[in-house]
Interface confidence: low
């Protein structure tokens, strides 16, 4: 018997297209397919940045695939040809790795790119960047951000920096159109009369860096003699009910008496009759069934009761 | 409504391979998990393996490590089990299972609350 062997894929590369980080990885089919006609040939393809302790696989029929990356680091990518069992009349063959590598050229030393880069997308409505200048650039050193996302045709500069001592110091950005629920790219590159800036890369989805506004319509009612319903609204704009975690801190005669997380615009509280005075605020977050992650919104306005007899009271605010 | 189809199991002796394949159909969004289960018989079912549609991040419990791979088809809509060095204790029924609600997987041992559509099942059976 002849042992069965199978070329690796032809022409790999990785093709950058410009859109900060999301890249495409292409490839030819191998040469000399002709024994294998009645065949279809599937790729088994890797992938990871560099320093990466795993790869990304991916078994396709297709000649390429697409997947975003960290381009402050390079990318490695290696592919081989799959001959699956029903081709061979045995067992699966695979031919050698095909690898290559992609970087981009890093310009400037670190310390001149941009500093705790930080943004947040508000109420889910407004996206705002903000960073400090690279240590020891000169007052002459400008910041531009450009972003991405899929849905745009190409990368688009911010058009409206927020700036200190004429230096950009930050991006607000403009209505994002379907925007969340996907990789948002971005790149912060800088330029100088005297030293050449190092660009920086981030990577993040919108829904997980949303900083809700607070709750409103802060109420108390009175739901027995010993329980007390705690009530509140969502706040204003596009978030949905379904989305929240809340966070409340309850006051009773100036001593914390609790804080709880719940899910609903609800909170019933055990009192005692001895109580003179309940003060409760509450805070909200996106939750667990909208994003991986998010920002605690400010505190709403406190709503308090004072009398000389809470058990006896309906109290609505 | 999401149907889950798996497929791939049967027979094999210890030590040996398997792929399992999951097809994912009826559904609408891009971001979503999927998670293969296991149950042996008189046992609890267990999670597996688990890989996100958007970030590719993938977890696996302790006991399969090093063996099983997950993966993910072009079309996003298949993902596989690749099982090799294969263990008698291996042998159950294996589940694919999708929750459309997250876009990255939780942590192994708390798998099993996050998930909303469930595959019929297909057996794996290690034996000499």
């Known amino acids: 018997d002849t042992e069965i062997k199978v070329n690796p894929p032809q022409d790999f590369e990785i093709v950058d297209p410009g859109y900060l980080g999301y890249l495409y990885l292409q490839w030819q089919p191998p040469l000399s397919l002709d024994h294998f006609k009645e065949c279809t040939v599937e790729y088994e393809l890797k992938y990871r940045n560099i320093g990466s302790e795993t790869w990304k696989t991916i078994i396709t029929k297709n000649l390429h695939y697409k997947d975003g990356f960290d381009l402050n680091k390079g990318i490695e990518a290696k592919i081989h040809t799959l001959l699956p069992w029903q081709c061979t009349n045995g067992s699966e063959v695979q031919s050698s790795w095909a690898e290559t590598t992609y970087w981009i050229s890093p310009q400037g030393i670190p310390e001149t790119k941009v500093q705790d880069m930080d943004c947040v997308y508000y109420n889910w409505q407004y996206l705002l960047c903000s960073w400090k200048p690279g240590i020891g650039v000169l007052l002459d050193t400008n910041y531009n951000l450009f972003y991405w996302y899929e849905g745009l045709d190409h990368a688009l500069q911010c058009v409206d920096y927020i700036k200190a001592d004429g230096q950009n110091i930050g991006c607000r950005f403009p209505y994002l159109e379907a925007s969340d629920y996907k990789d948002f790219y971005i790149c912060v590159n800088g330029s100088s009369e005297n030293k050449p800036i190092r660009s920086s890369y981030f990577t993040f989805q919108l829904q997980n860096i949303v900083k809700p506004l607070p709750p409103v319509y802060l109420t108390f009612t009175r739901e027995s003699s010993c329980e007390i319903k705690l009530k509140w609204s969502i706040p204003l704009g596009p978030i949905p009910a379904r989305c929240f975690d809340y966070e409340i801190e309850i006051r009773e005669d100036d001593t914390t008496l609790v804080t709880a997380t719940v899910e609903n615009e609800t909170y019933t509280l055990k009192t005692t009759n001895e109580t003179r005075q309940l003060c409760f605020v509450v805070r909200s977050k996106v939750n667990i069934y909208c994003s991986d992650d998010g920002i605690w919104s400010e505190w709403s306005d406190k709503q308090c009761w004072e009398g000389e007899d809470l058990s006896k009271k309906t109290l609505l605010r | 409504d999401v149907q889950l189809v798996e497929s791939g199991g049967g027979l094999v002796q210890p030590g040996g391979s398997l792929r399992l394949s999951c097809e994912a159909s009826g559904f609408a969004s891009d971001d979503y998990i999927i998670g293969w289960f296991r149950q042996a018989p008189g046992k609890e079912r267990e999670g597996v393996s688990c890989?996100?549609?958007?970030?590719?991040?993938?977890v696996y419990t302790d006991s399969v490590k090093g063996r099983f791979r997950i993966s993910r088809g072009t079309a996003k809509n298949t993902v596989y089990l690749q099982m090799s060095a294969l263990k008698p204790e291996d042998t159950a029924v294996y589940y694919c299972?999708?929750?459309?609600?997250?876009?990255?997987?939780?942590?192994?041992?708390?798998?099993?609350?996050?998930?909303?559509?469930w595959g019929q099942g297909t057996q794996v059976t290690v034996s000499s």
């Open positions: 299972a999708m929750d459309s609600r997250r876009v990255t997987c939780p942590e192994i041992s708390t798998m099993h609350r996050n998930f909303d559509s």
């Open positions: 890989i996100s549609s958007r970030y590719a991040n993938t």
